[in-house]
Each structure stands twice: as structure tokens, then as C-alpha cells.
């Protein structure tokens, strides 16, 4: 049986839109159906319709099709907003260029190349012919429009109104000539919908024949309209998935604009000392990845062959072996000179200060009255008066309404980490604003601490070295997997939430990650009965400078004999010096025959001042850090353990007091480890758990 082609790719979709006919003479036809695809197939074939179908509306609420012999450009018609409607217009009737020989062209050009008006197809004056609309059904020989019903070489043509000239081609440009792009086409939003070999593009909102991750609702800024060519992932030029099952995707033939300069809106802010956003504009000279491995030159093919060359990416400044972000990755990166590590991120480059001009706050910003109304990720704040119900849900006093004007960043709940606001995005209910503490402000944001001073953390590799294999129940320990390999540790603090480190996420694509719970062996050997494998649905980045991430699981973990949660400390608490604690990890461990088993190293808490002395005064610790030293020489956290916990026991209760982050040395005698102090961020963690929606089991 011949499979009917899916014709919805031939339509331009306008969501939440319908057409209203002002002219009562215009016909429409309706019928109950299940999907927009069914409407499209019938429209394309004109089956059972008393007119040539040019557009249709799918009514999602009533599951109904409305077929039209007109489109939004026709006279006697107007567009109207409607939540339940999606308008689909046949692209052939709205396109003003041709593809190939123009057989499918159904536009309204009616003048020949030399400027002669076309003769109507239904007329025999001045030229008799056999191209009757009735003989060429589906070829749309309407009015006197240029057409190419037989797909002949010269493109669309018509009989002319000049008795001396029987027929002539029309001057309709190729779509590939009309369309042009700048740079690598990341900002291209044109209407090219077929590949360089002529294959029709698959709609971005479809998953057949090719399943993919580029869902329009997931990437609203990437322009995934209909089935138009786009460049969302740093390819050399725009591309699309195709309707050919054996050609997953292909490039599109879009020429470079004569003036190949990027619009001001597309140019990333150039920086040389720090990273703004994802660092697409970083033009500095750092040339090693985060752990010190040197970068491979962009113009070299050794040790890694690649096509990310200066010739392919002329606008991206791929000079020497400097860290760059030419493809919209998480941050600047490079190919490495280690044959076993293809790429690495240069996460040691600091973020630029995001503060807006002179705007700053004192203490924790509860008295901040500036007029910034944007979150650190660029979302516009939503009005406080629309969110009062949510605010009351997590504070136990009446907020000062006089301060909560408009949608300005404020701190009505005494958040330790500064002003914030609600957003209109249901996935990110609220976030902090990009405002720094005022320079010279030393007001502690929490009490009971030594003098808070600024830290100067350096990035070094960390892994649990010479630890002993654990045997006790550590069901809260999580192995974060990146592209099927263990990359980091983490702690299960709630059924749907894992506390881990920011450095554990080299890619923004959440499909690259999984959380393994209930395992003892890093490869899951022998843990089959107790292992739970969960996808990751969201990353919530901690307050600026925290290095923390709360990772939301796609479904809640099932708590059992092998999987459990670990408690958080009270906000701002301190734990006595010499308290015995432990760090856990699967990082490679200094042993030649590494067995892949989870290991523990025993440490004890050390005061911040004493800790600083052990670091020979080169390190000053602040209120967001906690220090722990090894009981035996050379035992402590190292690479592969980032994100894992420093666990301490007090009053018979085990808590996660610290998180391992790239930091201050690896198991060096008399050099204690420095961890992110969870107690300092406990309120933030509780606030996220309380306000972010989680899936139900």
C-alpha cells in the first residue's frame, strides 16, 4: 500500500489565528477531524471541496477543519486572534519566488519578463491554446497569473496580451536568490523550506520521520516556524531535518548577503577579560580549558579533526588556540591537545560583572528601591500585584506593599542573596536580578560568622584520593551522567531535587544528562536491582557566585532501601570545629586498578581563619564557604567528585554541609579542602523547592 505523503509541510502556520470573511459570497467548508495533518492532506488534494483550497483553520477545541478558497492576503477577509485556532496557509499561494522550475508557483505575478501583461488562461484572445483550467486541474490556471503547469525549463510563463508575442517567461526570482544570510545564518529568519538538494524540510514541530530535540516551545528564540531552514546549533549555515528517512538533515542553499555584516541586535557584546552571557562575544586570549590542558589551534586538525575552522566561521574570531564560543554552547570552549579529550570548557574565565551602572544594594537589598525590572537571565519581571498570592505562600508576614511597586526588583522576603522578582515564565517562577552589593558594603548577610571577605578561588581538579570504599547506606548519593559517562556527584535532597555544582554541566541540552541513584559502582555493575535512572528536566542556578545548581528530575525518585534523601542544615548555622565529616565520590582515585566503587574520605571541620593559615594566608574565606581538613595525609576530594557532598553528623542527624566545587587543591598535606557552605544557601534551596513546580509521581 502506497503511503500517503504528509502535506502539512506545505503550509505556513499562524498560531492562535483564524480568518473571518467580510465578503459573504466567499465559501467555506467544515468537517470534524482529529488532526491538522488530516486537514492539510484534504486541502492539498482538494478532495470533496467545491473550490481550490488555499488555506485552512484547525479548531483545536472542537477538533474541526475549516477549509478556505482564500488566504490572509485575499480581499474580503480579515485575520482574527483566537486561542483555539491555528491558521495554515498553502505556501505556494503566498510565496513570491520559485523553487526549481517553479512548477508549484501559485503567486499573483501576471506580467512577463519584458513587461507585457499576461492573457487570461480561460481566454482564447489573442492566442488560441490548449492550456485550459479544466484540463490542468490542480495547476491553478487562474486569472492571468504566470504558471508552469508542465514544469518546463524556463520557469513560470504565460500567453501574452500582445498578439505579436505568443508567450513569454515571467521574471520571478529563485527563492535561493531572494533569501540571504549574514555570518553563519544564526539570525536567519527567512522562508527557505527545502535543502540544497531539493528535499522538503520537516516541520520543527513534527517528530517524523526524524525525532529531534529542537522543539519550538522549548527554544522560542530560535525561530522554529513551520519547516524553514534555521541554524540553532552553530553549524556553518542554516539547515533543516528532511522528509527523506535516510537524510536526517541537510544544509539549505542560502547565499550570503552582499553586505555580510551582522545587525546590531545580533552582535554579541565583545569582551576580552570576562564572559558576558554565554561568551559568544569573548575575544580574550585564554588558551587552556578549566583544568589547564592546552587548547588545540582552530586551524589545526591534530589531534582532533573538525570543521570548526576559521574559514567556516569567519565572524567568530577563531584565532590561534584561544577559547571561543562559535556554536552557542554553554560557554567558551576549545578542542584540546589531549587526544583522549575532544573538547573542554574554559570555565575558569570569570563572568563579567552583570551590575547595571551605579545600581547596587546594601546588606541583603531589602531596602533596595531602584527601578531595574529584569532578571539575571534577561526575563522581564512581572507585576508584584499579580503575584501576591504566591508571595504570601512563602513568607509569614505582611510584605510592605508600598515598596512593591510596578515590576521592579525587590526583596520582600528578606532573601540573603539580594533583590529578585517574579517572571511570567511558568518554568522559572522567580529569579534574582543582576544587581551587585555596593562596593565597600561589608554588612554580613547572615550573623555568627568571622569577618566576611572576598574569596579568590582558583580552579584545580578534584577527586576523592586514597579514600576507603563505602559500605554504609548512602542512598542520597547521585551519579550525574553526561553523555552516558559519570561526570559528577550530587545529593538527593528531595524526591525531585538534586543539589550539585554548576561546573557539572558542560552542555545546555538536558537530554545529555541522567541521574543514577541507588548505585555503589560507578558503572552500575551489580546494582541492577536497586538502580534508578532518571532524566533531568531543569537546572536552577544558584545565587551569583554560589557555584550551586539545583537539578530537577523529570520524575520523583522512589525512596526505598537503596535511595533516600539527605537533610539540609538550618540556614546560617555553624558547626563546631573538629566535627568529623565525610566526602563521597566516584572520581578516579589515585589507585592504579580503580574499581569504580563509591569512596569516602574522612575530614574534620576547621574554622575559616585557621583554614586560611593552612593555605599560608593566600586564601581568605567568606561567609559562603566551609573548610574541612583530612585526618590522614592525601585524602580528600578530587576531579569527578564535583557536586558531591561534605556530610557531617550532629545530634545523630546526617546533613549535607558542603558541596565539592573546583577549588583549592587536591589532597595536599596540611591543605584543607574548601567547600560551598550549604547553610549559607539553605533559604534559597527551600525557596526553590517551595516555588518551582515538580512532576507528580
Amino acid at each position: 500500500q502506497r503511503k500517503r505523503r504528509n502535506t502539512i509541510h506545505e503550509f505556513k502556520k499562524s498560531a492562535k489565528t483564524t480568518l473571518i470573511k467580510i465578503d459573504p459570497a466567499l465559501k467555506i467548508k467544515t468537517k470534524k477531524v482529529n488532526t491538522a495533518d488530516q486537514c492539510a492532506n484534504r486541502c492539498t488534494r482538494n478532495k470533496g471541496l467545491p473550490f481550490t483550497c488555499k488555506a485552512f483553520v484547525f479548531d483545536k477545541a472542537r477538533k474541526q477543519c475549516l477549509w478556505f478558497p482564500f488566504n490572509s492576503m485575499s480581499s474580503g477577509v480579515k485575520k482574527e486572534f483566537g486561542h483555539e485556532f491555528d491558521l495554515y496557509e498553502n505556501k505556494d499561494y503566498i510565496r513570491n519566488c520559485i523553487i526549481g522550475k517553479g512548477r508549484s508557483y501559485k503567486g499573483t505575478v501576471s506580467i512577463t519578463k519584458s513587461g507585457i501583461k499576461c492573457q487570461p488562461w480561460s481566454s482564447m484572445i489573442p492566442h488560441e491554446h490548449s492550456f485550459l483550467p479544466s484540463s490542468y486541474r490542480g495547476k491553478d490556471l487562474q486569472e492571468n497569473y504566470c504558471r508552469n503547469p508542465r514544469g518546463e525549463e524556463g520557469g513560470p510563463w504565460c500567453f501574452t496580451s500582445n498578439p505579436e508575442v505568443r508567450y513569454e517567461v515571467c521574471d520571478i526570482p529563485q527563492c535561493s536568490e531572494v533569501e540571504c544570510m549574514t555570518c553563519n545564518g544564526e539570525s536567519y529568519r527567512g522562508l527557505m523550506d527545502h535543502t540544497e538538494s531539493g528535499k522538503i524540510c520537516q516541520r520543527w514541530d513534527h517528530q517524523t520521520p526524524h525525532r529531534h530535540k529542537f522543539l519550538p516551545e522549548r527554544y522560542p528564540d530560535k525561530g522554529f516556524d513551520d519547516n524553514y531552514c534555521r541554524n540553532p546549533d552553530g553549524q556553518p549555515r542554516p539547515w533543516c531535518y528532511t522528509l527523506d528517512p535516510h537524510t536526517r538533515w541537510e544544509y539549505c542553499a542560502i547565499k550570503t548577503c552582499a553586505d555580510n555584516t551582522m545587525n546590531d541586535t545580533d552582535v554579541p557584546l565583545e569582551t576580552t577579560e570576562c564572559i558576558q552571557g554565554q561568551g559568544e562575544g569573548y575575544r580574550g586570549t585564554v588558551n587552556t580549558i578549566w583544568n589547564g590542558i592546552p587548547c588545540q589551534r582552530w586551524d589545526s586538525q591534530y589531534p582532533h579533526e573538525h570543521d570548526m575552522t576559521p574559514e567556516n566561521f569567519k565572524c567568530k574570531d577563531l584565532r590561534e588556540n584561544y577559547c571561543r564560543n562559535p556554536d552557542g554552547s554553554e560557554s567558551p570552549w576549545c578542542f584540546t591537545t589531549d587526544p583522549n579529550i575532544r573538547v573542554g570548557y574554559c570555565s575558569q574565565i570569570p563572568n563579567c560583572d552583570m551590575s547595571h551602572g551605579q545600581d547596587c544594594y546594601r546588606g541583603n537589598g531589602k531596602n533596595y528601591m531602584g527601578n531595574l525590572s529584569q532578571t539575571r537571565s534577561g526575563l522581564t519581571c512581572s507585576m508584584w500585584d499579580k503575584n501576591m498570592e504566591d508571595l504570601h505562600r512563602h513568607i509569614f508576614w505582611e510584605p510592605d506593599a508600598s515598596k512593591l511597586n510596578e515590576n521592579y526588583c525587590r526583596n520582600p522576603d528578606d532573601d540573603a542573596h539580594g533583590p529578585w522578582c517574579y517572571t511570567g515564565n511558568p518554568l522559572i517562577p522567580w529569579d534574582y536580578c543582576p544587581i551587585s552589593r555596593c562596593e565597600g558594603d561589608t554588612t554580613p548577610t547572615i550573623v555568627n560568622l568571622d569577618h566576611p571577605v572576598i574569596s579568590c578561588a582558583k580552579t584545580k581538579q578534584l577527586r576523592v584520593v586514597n579514600g576507603i570504599p563505602t559500605r554504609t547506606n548512602i542512598g542520597w548519593m547521585v551519579s550525574l551522567r553526561y553523555r552516558n559517562k559519570h561526570i559528577c556527584g550530587g545529593s538527593l535532597i528531595k524526591e525531585s531535587w538534586v543539589l550539585t555544582a554548576r561546573q557539572c554541566f558542560p552542555s545546555r541540552d538536558l537530554k545529555d544528562y541522567e541521574a543514577w541513584l541507588g548505585i555503589h559502582d560507578v558503572h552500575g555493575r551489580g546494582d541492577e536491582k536497586c538502580k534508578q535512572v532518571l532524566n533531568v528536566s531543569q537546572l536552577v542556578y544558584g545565587p551569583e557566585g554560589s557555584d550551586l545548581v539545583l537539578m530537577k528530575l523529570a520524575r520523583p525518585a522512589v525512596l526505598d532501601d537503596f535511595v533516600s534523601t539527605i537533610d539540609l542544615p538550618n540556614y546560617g548555622c555553624t558547626i563546631p570545629e573538629k566535627t568529623s565529616c565525610s566526602v563521597y565520590g566516584w572520581g578516579y582515585t589515585g589507585l592504579i586498578n580503580y574499581d569504580g566503587l563509591l569512596r569516602v574520605a574522612h575530614l574534620y571541620i576547621m574554622g575559616n581563619e585557621k583554614c586560611s593559615q593552612h593555605h599560608r594566608g593566600k586564601v581568605t574565606l567568606n561567609e559562603s564557604e566551609i573548610c574541612a581538613g583530612a585526618e590522614k595525609i592525601g585524602s580528600g576530594p578530587c576531579e569527578g567528585d564535583y557536586g558531591g557532598p561534605l556530610v557531617c553528623e550532629q545530634h545523630k542527624m546526617r546533613m549535607v554541609l558542603g558541596v565539592i566545587v573546583p577549588g583549592r587543591g587536591c589532597a595536599i598535606p596540611n591543605r584543607p579542602g574548601i567547600f560551598v557552605r550549604v547553610a549559607y544557601y539553605a533559604k534559597w534551596i527551600h525557596k526553590i523547592i517551595l516555588t518551582y513546580k515538580v512532576p507528580q509521581s
Epitope: 556553518p236 537524510t247 586538525q301 591534530y302 582532533h304 579533526e305 556554536d327 554552547s329
Partner: nanobody
Framework: EVQLVESGGGLVQAGDSLRLSCAAS????????MAWFRQVPEKEREFVAA????????YYADSVKGRCTISRDNAKNTVYLQMNSLKPEDTAVYYC??????????????????WGQGTQVTVSS
């Protein structure tokens, strides 16, 4: 545009060897990076091995490292996958894939544009 046809699959015993071939036509084979992926029913296609256009760079999935070798013969427009010490868990449909562009990654499905129909490999215990 590249067309790919795999061959060499079949039924073998655990511990045996097998050599898969993938013949390319209709494009410039020498300018394509090549890879093998495999798929078992109800699972996503998984990466097995890749080889750069020059043949100088190869990558392998951990699950096949040391047991599989990918190679290419640009004169014959063919890429090979030599599989030794086969295990029952190697049972899958094996697909050949071609890429015109390698960026930061070379092991994901989206790194490859053109795909063959697949050849079945069954390893019995």
C-alpha cells in the same frame, strides 16, 4: 547527496567476529566523516564508532572499545567496522552514517546527515 548501503550482518555465536561494510555513492566520500550507530527495538540509536574524513581520528563508544575497529578505504568509497569477541548485548541493527561537518561533537545522531537502511547483527549465546 550521499547514499549508504550496509552489508555483512548476520547471525553469529558469542565470541565470534564479524566485519560490517558500508558502501557510499552519490557524493564525495572523501569529504565525509563516517560513523556506525546501532539500535535495539524501543531504544534510541546509540553511537558505536566514528572515523574522520582523513582516517586520522577515530572515536569509540566505551562499550566496544578494544573489541571494534573502524576503518575506511577512500578509493573504494567504503567504511568498515571490524567487531571481535561479540557478546549477546551487541545484538542490534547497525547503521552507517555520513557527516559533512564535525563540530564540538562527533558521536550524536545529529552530527550525521546521511544514513543507511541498516544491517541486522544477532549474537546468540
Amino acid at each position: 547527496e550521499v547514499q549508504l548501503v550496509e552489508s555483512g550482518g548476520g547471525l553469529v555465536q558469542a565470541g565470534d567476529s564479524l566485519r560490517l561494510s558500508c558502501a557510499a555513492s552519490g557524493g564525495t566520500f572523501g569529504s565525509s566523516h563516517m560513523a556506525w550507530f546501532r539500535q535495539v527495538p524501543e531504544k534510541e540509536r546509540e553511537f558505536v564508532a566514528a572515523i574522520s574524513r582523513s582516517g586520522g581520528t577515530t572515536y569509540y563508544a566505551d562499550s566496544v572499545k578494544g573489541r571494534c575497529t573502524i576503518s575506511r578505504d577512500n578509493a573504494k568509497n567504503t567504511v568498515y567496522l571490524q567487531m571481535n569477541s561479540l557478546k549477546p548485548e551487541d545484538t542490534a541493527v547497525y547503521y552507517c552514517a555520513a557527516a559533512r561537518f564535525w563540530g564540538s561533537t562527533s558521536t550524536r545522531m545529529d552530527d550525521y546527515q546521511y544514513w543507511g537502511q541498516g544491517t541486522q547483527v544477532t549474537v546468540s549465546s
